[in-house]
Amino acid sequence: YDFTNCDFEKIKAAYLSTISKDLITYMSGTKSTEFNNTVSCSNRPHCLTEIQSLTFNPTAGCASLAKEMFAMKTKAALAIWCPGYSETQINATQAMKKRRKRKVTTNKCLEQVSQLQGLWRRFNRPLLKQQ
């Protein structure tokens, strides 16, 4: 999906009012310095591409993030504020349902959510120069 035509300000508002705290709660008990940010993004469409990938695509050591509350809210926000997103995701979801995993919090998942927090921070500050 091409995130270029999303309403970025509405997605930012959604993040600030309904998503960010759930990421913090997921990470509770973890030091903010525990993980280094290794995933970056250069602009808002790129950030959303990376956020979608980290949130919904199972990875080695962390297969379950898609069933977390913050992921559900992300899915809902993208569907509302990115034209055509819901249509493109319907087929992808049918495939995902066949491999729905039980929610398990692993260190790899914590690291992945830490990366997500960094991507969201970057998304919310699009005018900052890339480090």
């Epitope: 600030l16 309904t18 709660t25």
Partner: antibody, heavy 117, light 108 residues
């Protein structure tokens, strides 16, 4: 303007079935997570069920296995199929637009379901 | 699912400040929403994301959430504010929406 209109409520005997419908207008229905919330007479609000644009569903434990939520995005319509109805299912059933999965920003006017012999 | 606890009733004199509490385990780690419901009407969202007001909701409505308690505050309460108020959050395991039992606000 944004509107949700429920229909299909009525009197049904215990063990019976009923299908509620909700016609949505004024917004891109196919993009939103939609849900049903009920309110027994003189009681509080109880979330019943919700459904994503892609058909992914969630249910309250009290209705799991008896109620089925569905949607037809081409008709901008939300449904609630209620089977094996019990007296305790008697309530006003509200169709609701659930913003960002976690709260309700638009409510219908409600339709009354009475389960009684 | 988590349980949200509200006082059944709260009374306030016109022009005074009404505070309605909503208690739940580690509630401060989740977002809380508040709805106003008048007799025979559907609920109306008055606070979202702990403390934000939807457009059209008067400034006298405000919200806070920390620890195990969220609070809806109505400053300079008016007769038209008499209604039932429901807090709402969600369960992080089941992902279900959860409502408090409701509080009847009486403006004396």
């Amino acid at each position: 303007q944004v509107q949700l209109v429920e229909s299909g409520g009525g009197l049904v005997q215990p063990g019976g079935s009923l299908r509620l419908s909700c016609a949505a207008s004024g917004f891109t229905f196919s993009s939103y997570y939609m849900s049903w919330v009920r309110q027994a007479p003189g009681k509080g609000l109880e979330w019943v069920s919700g459904i994503f644009f892609d058909g992914e569903t969630y249910y309250a434990d009290s209705v799991k296995g008896r109620f089925t939520i569905s949607r037809d995005n081409s008709k901008n319509t939300l449904y609630l199929q209620m089977n094996s109805l019990r007296a305790e299912d008697t309530a006003v059933y509200y169709c609701a637009r659930q913003q960002y999965f976690d709260h309700i920003d638009i409510w219908g006017q409600g339709t009354l379901v009475t389960v009684s012999s | 699912d988590i349980e949200l606890t509200q006082p059944p009733s709260v009374s306030v004199a016109p022009g005074q400040t009404a505070r309605i509490s909503c208690g739940g385990d580690s509630l401060g780690g989740k977002y809380v929403y508040w709805y106003q419901q008048k007799p025979g009407q559907a609920p109306v969202l008055v606070i979202y994301g702990d403390s934000k007001r939807p457009s059209g909701i008067p400034e006298r409505f405000s919200g806070s959430n920390s620890g195990n308690t969220a609070t809806l505050t109505i400053s300079g309460t008016q007769a038209e504010d008499e209604a039932d108020y429901y807090c709402q959050s969600y369960d992080l395991k089941s992902l279900n929406v959860v409502f408090g039992g409701g509080t009847k606000l009486t403006v004396l």
